[in-house]
């Protein structure tokens, strides 16, 4: 029997300090550019080497950004989201959603939380 793929979704608050070259990442998504089917949210598409986000290490490509400095990113045009980041100031607080892929084995397979015997 084949295993199935599940996702573990977690949220995290990430505080970044804008570096010399900015925050150091790219985004996709928005109401005019759905990146994920039926989801107009904003997603991290690239983390730039040696940028603030990369040096911090917590933000990952594929993360969904839920808010910036407390401002919700729902129902924003792509460029409006970009502008929000650019105008976010020196200290930037991001609420992000990580989506980790978890490979589950066939039924009866011992889970990670089970005793190893």
């Amino acid at each position: 029997m084949n295993g199935r793929v599940d996702y573990l979704v977690t949220e995290e608050e990430i505080n970044l300090t804008r570096g010399p070259s900015g925050l150091g990442f790219n985004i996709v998504g928005g109401t005019d550019q759905q990146y994920v089917s039926n989801d107009s949210g904003i997603y991290v598409s690239r983390i730039k080497e040696n940028g603030a986000a990369a040096l911090d290490g917590r933000l990952q490509e594929g993360d969904k950004i839920l808010s910036v400095n407390g401002q919700d990113l729902k129902n924003l045009l792509h460029q409006d989201a970009v502008d929000l980041f650019r105008n976010a100031g020196y200290a930037v607080s991001l609420r992000v959603q990580h989506r980790l892929q978890v490979q589950n084995g066939p039924i009866g397979h011992r889970g990670e939380g089970d005793p190893s015997g």
């Epitope: 070259s21 550019q33 990146y35 792509h78 980041f85």
Partner: nanobody, 125 residues
Framework: EVQLVESGGGLVQPGGSVRVSCVSS????????IGWFRQAPGKEREGVSC???????YYVDSVKGRFTISRDNAKNTVYLQMNSLKPEDTAVYYC????????????????????WGQGTQVTVS
């Protein structure tokens, strides 16, 4: 493997026109920002025009009204139509691609791009 290949350059008379193309392979163009840059002998590479992932176009002041950028995602191709060419437009023209929009700088900033083509020479003489 991500690849960008420019074509369509050549020798053109002042006041003439030329269209250069950038064909991408190894990725789907849809969510990519594409920029055109040029480098004249002895000068730094400069941004000419770019088009973001939702089709918004940007131009450096010196080419506004003369150059037009467009994209055909179905053909994985971005075009730069250059009209009313001047001798100072002579340069090697490069296209570049970046996945998504930088939250830090406009797409005319060459430091934001991850992928570059080899360039095509345009000579106005």
């Amino acid at each position: 493997e991500v690849q960008l290949v420019e074509s369509g350059g050549g020798l053109v008379q002042p006041g003439g026109s030329v269209r250069v193309s950038c064909v991408s392979s190894g990725f789907i163009l849809d969510y990519y920002v594409i920029g055109w840059f040029r480098q004249a002998p002895g000068k730094e590479r400069e941004g000419v025009s770019c088009i973001d992932s939702v089709g918004r176009a940007y131009y450096v002041d010196s080419v506004k009204g003369r150059f037009t950028i467009s994209r055909d995602n179905a053909k994985n191709t971005v075009y730069l139509q250059m009209n009313s060419l001047k001798p100072e437009d002579t340069a090697v023209y490069y296209c570049a691609a970046d996945f998504g929009s930088s939250v830090d700088s406009t797409c005319l900033n060459n430091q934001q791009y991850d992928y570059w083509g080899q360039g095509t020479q345009v000579t106005v003489s």
